[in-house]
């Protein structure tokens, strides 16, 4: 039975050209986390494998940094980065848990005056 829950940063906004941390946290389960996938729509951004560490997809190598922890840092943000991001926790024996984050990348002036979910 899957008892765990994923907590995420929810809906966040960030400034164009800046960076943002995507964070998820799995709680309420003793299941072993074997791998965490970070995906944008159907595109794989990065994977943190418990045995082998971080693998960053080649196409995102220059704009994605691992961490902190099992989180992911997106850098040099563009308006095209706006959208849904998913953290997918592969666990044993529970199975797969998925968390969702919506990121809105705003033009500089808009982000400065209207960002409601800005993460420093």
């Amino acid at each position: 039975m899957m008892t765990g829950t994923i907590e995420t940063t929810g809906n966040i906004s960030a400034e164009k050209g800046g960076s943002i941390i995507l964070q998820c946290h799995l709680s309420s389960t003793t299941a072993q986390v074997t791998q965490v996938n970070w995906e944008q729509q159907d595109q794989l951004l990065a994977i943190c494998n418990a045995d082998l560490g971080w693998h960053i997809s080649p196409s995102f190598k220059d704009r994605v940094a691992p961490g902190p922890g099992l989180g992911l840092t997106l850098q040099s943000l563009t308006v095209n980065d706006t959208g849904e991001y998913f953290c997918i926790y592969h666990t044993y024996p529970d199975g797969t848990y998925t968390g969702r984050i919506f990121l809105e990348v705003l033009e500089s002036s808009v982000a400065e005056h209207g960002a409601r979910f800005q993460i420093p």
Epitope: N37, E39, I47, D51, L52, G53, W54, H55, K61, P66
Partner: antibody, heavy 128, light 107 residues
Framework: EVQLVESGGGLVQPGGSLRLSCAAS????????MDWVRQAPGKGLEWVGR??????????EYAASVKGRFTISRDDSKNSLYLQMNSLKTEDTAVYYC???????????????????WGQGTTVTVSS | EIVLTQSPGTLSLSPGERATLSCRAS???????LAWYQQKPGQAPRLLIY???SRATGIPDRFSGSGSGTDFTLTISRLEPEDFAVYYC????????FGGGTKVEIK
């Protein structure tokens, strides 16, 4: 051409130290994990340890038999891998190979790891 | 630590024959973490198979790998003179470990 060339082997007394080098060329060194593997005379292959890549903060892992005595490091600016061997024992006598670790994902949930490029090896003899 | 046991230790066969090499793990191994290497005297190992069944670049199709869980097999469908060598299986771990090797020698 993708190539690894080891150097630094030689004869050393028990308790002594030696530093092996591995020069890499023909690929983006900083992207790759790098492993050291050794082979004692007439024996099989034994993994010594590994350094991960830049994305993984160059973290290192070691076999139990060398932990605390051997240190793996790298210099991406020189495309070079190193193995510092201290407190050497006679059982460390072997040919030492450096190898490129290939860590990638064929799909979102299948991580592959293997050593696809090997150096020619350098011989370390520990004897009094 | 996962122990890989290879059998037989030595396989005596003639060119043209089929070779079947076994690698058994002390506990379950992800198939994508299992690789096979060939080593000839005085040479470095060479990658043959990765992910239990995928041939490395430039490896002839007479080499094939199969298996999952704790039992893996390397098959050489028709032995060529250059195939007589020692073969090692390897898993990622941690820690990474090799099997003890199987020597394929000319009968």
């Amino acid at each position: 051409e993708v190539q690894l060339v080891e150097s630094g082997g030689g004869l050393v007394q028990p308790g002594g130290s030696l530093r092996l080098s591995c020069a890499a060329s023909g690929f983006t060194f900083s992207d790759h994990y790098m492993d050291w593997v050794r082979q004692a005379p007439g024996k099989g292959l034994e993994w010594v340890g590994r350094t991960r890549n830049k994305a993984n903060s160059y973290t290192t892992e070691y076999a139990a038999s060398v932990k605390g005595r051997f240190t793996i490091s790298r210099d991406d600016s020189k495309n070079s891998l190193y193995l510092q061997m201290n407190s050497l024992k006679t059982e460390d006598t072997a040919v030492y190979y450096c190898a490129r670790g290939q860590y990638y994902y064929g799909s979102s949930s299948r991580g592959y790891y293997y050593m696809d490029v090997w150096g020619q090896g350098t011989t370390v003899t520990v004897s009094s | 630590e996962i122990v890989l046991t290879q059998s037989p230790g030595t396989l005596s066969l003639s060119p043209g024959e089929r070779a079947t090499l076994s690698c058994r793990a002390s506990q379950s191994v992800r198939s994508s973490y299992l690789a096979w290497y060939q080593q000839k005297p005085g040479q470095a190992p060479r990658l043959l198979i990765y992910g239990a069944s995928s041939r490395a670049t430039g490896i002839p199709d007479r080499f094939s790998g199969s298996g999952s869980g704790t039992d893996f097999t390397l098959t050489i469908s028709r032995l060529e003179p250059e195939d007589f060598a020692v073969y090692y299986c390897q898993q990622v771990g941690p820690p990474l470990t090799f099997g003890g090797g199987t020597k394929v020698e000319i009968k």
